[in-house]
Interface confidence: medium
């Protein structure tokens, strides 16, 4: 048995391959600056509430500083796109490392969109969710690369199949690899071939750069092209990018503004 890239979804149970309706999928459209301004206080309160996050962030921050100081040893950090800050790099390192943070974060993301209240009051990874979302936007626009074929191996995750033609999302942030062999090696339960248009290559910011990792955001939608479940070997699922779909947008900022004056929340 084996594990997937960046400890992908290990230890998980059977899950439907669907639109992941409970996933928190905010794209922060129109509130990036407001969110950035809110980060210091928010991050501090989340550290207090979530030890795994605090410890994971501290370790990743140490690693980021080490890589900055000893770039020639690690292979120098790639040129960062405009707007890319240290905290984006730390967030990507924290996410890709072999620590429980990755698993807990994605489990929380999959549930945080059950309701707006659930996100606001029970999701203690708001900072990390925002930083990863923004980091992927920045990296994708910087690379100006269009869509790409990636591979994702998942261990311990059984999917209730969606038929060809179904529209699905991956439910959380999903790590995949540009290298077929890496994905197959680290997931013997389900193997995905994915044509992604919103995933961003994060090689230079990954704890394990050689995996040629691509990170796919939770709001990207895909069409199921084909599925197979052979008697031996992993189930195989092939997905093609369709677009993006979010139920939520700027929920934290909306809530902050509501606290300081009249507000209108719209349908979300």
């Amino acid at each position: 048995q084996s594990y997937s890239i960046s400890q992908l979804d290990i230890f998980s149970q059977e899950t439907p391959l669907d639109m992941a309706p409970a996933s928190f999928d905010d794209q922060y459209a129109g509130c990036l600056a407001d969110m950035t301004a809110a980060l210091p206080d928010l991050n501090h309160s989340e550290f207090q509430a979530n030890k795994v996050y605090a410890d994971g962030w501290a370790q990743a921050n140490n690693q980021w500083q080490e890589r900055r100081a000893w770039g020639s040893v690690w292979g120098s950090l790639p040129p960062s796109p405009p707007g890319f800050r240290d905290e984006h790099g730390v967030a990507l390192l924290a996410y890709t490392a072999n620590s429980p943070l990755h698993k807990e974060f994605n489990a929380a993301v999959r549930e945080a969109g059950r309701s707006r209240a659930h996100y606001l009051h029970h999701f203690s990874f708001k900072t990390l969710h925002f930083l990863l979302t923004e980091a992927l936007q920045l990296l994708r626009s910087h690379r100006s690369r269009g869509c790409q074929q990636v591979y994702r191996g998942v261990h311990g995750l059984r999917f209730r199949p969606a038929g060809p033609g179904a529209t699905v999302r991956l439910g959380g942030f999903a790590s995949a690899s540009l290298k077929n062999v890496a994905a197959q090696q680290f997931g013997e339960d389900t193997f995905f071939g994915i044509w992604t248009c919103l995933g961003a290559p994060i090689r230079g910011y990954s704890f394990f750069p050689e995996e040629e990792e691509v990170l796919i955001p939770p709001f990207e939608t895909f069409q199921v092209i084909n599925t197979s479940r052979p008697t031996q070997g992993p189930a195989r699922i092939y997905l093609r990018a369709l677009g993006k779909r979010s139920t939520y947008n700027c929920e934290y900022i909306k809530e902050k503004k509501c606290r300081s004056g009249p507000c209108w929340l719209g349908s979300s």
Epitope: Y3, V52, D55, A97, N98, S99, E104, F208
Partner: antibody
């Protein structure tokens, strides 16, 4: 620095359940995965399973039906239960930290467990 | 499941000599996931090399790792008396270990 110490019975009867505990000292248990690995006398190493402080577990398929792992963050401890023991389970049992580099970077000293009537 | 094979089973050398240990995987292994451990009698294993070629903290520079794909090598450039031990390679993906190579004094 972080140190690990296994504890539990040295002798267990066949068909019974082995219970071992690993105590983590000198550091936080929360940022890592924690594993159990065993080694029969004169033989190689066999990974048993791993756990996180949130209780996410992952077991070696060959042992999965007999293994249960748990964690008590307040005591900085994690535990192994292995049921339906046979003589083939006689081994030195190690606990180890699953480091961020995806390796077992810190090991306990090991505890010898003999399965015999 | 990836199977690791180590060779030779036993390597008999003298202090000061160079030791070359081989680890072969049944299918391609990402080098991020290949590690080497040293184990002396009555002791727990100790991490030597991770990521195929990175030395763990406190490991002397006479130990080096190399390789990619299916073939990996641990080299001890000049054997010291304390280096005589059993060496295991490990693939993190499946947390499997090779059977070990014993380096003993000729």
């Amino acid at each position: 620095q972080v140190q690990l110490q296994e504890s539990g019975p040295g002798l267990v009867k066949p068909s019974e359940t082995l219970s071992l505990t690993c105590t983590v000292s000198g550091g936080s248990i929360s940022s890592y995965y924690w594993s159990w690995i065993r080694q029969p006398a004169g033989k190689g190493l066999e990974w048993i399973g791993r756990i996180s402080t949130s209780g996410f577990t992952n077991y070696n398929p060959s042992l999965k039906s007999r293994v249960t792992m748990s964690v008590d963050s307040s005591k900085n401890q994690f535990s192994l239960k292995l049921s339906s023991l046979t003589a083939a389970d006689t081994a030195v049992y190690y606990c180890a930290r699953d480091g961020w580099g995806r390796v077992f970077d810190i090991w306990g000293l090991g505890t010898m467990v003999t399965v015999s009537s | 499941e990836i199977v690791l094979t180590q060779s030779p089973g036993t390597l008999s050398l003298s202090p000061g000599e160079r030791a070359t240990l081989s680890c072969r995987a049944s299918q391609s292994v990402s080098s991020s996931y290949l590690a080497w451990y040293q184990q002396k009698p009555g002791q727990a294993p100790r991490l030597l090399i991770y990521g195929a070629s990175s030395r763990a903290t406190g490991i002397p520079d006479r130990f080096s790792g190399s390789g990619s794909g299916t073939d990996f090598t641990l080299t001890i450039s000049r054997l010291e008396p304390e280096d005589f031990a059993v060496y295991y390679c490990q693939q993190y993906g499946s947390s499997t270990f090779g059977p070990g190579t014993k380096v003993d004094i000729k």
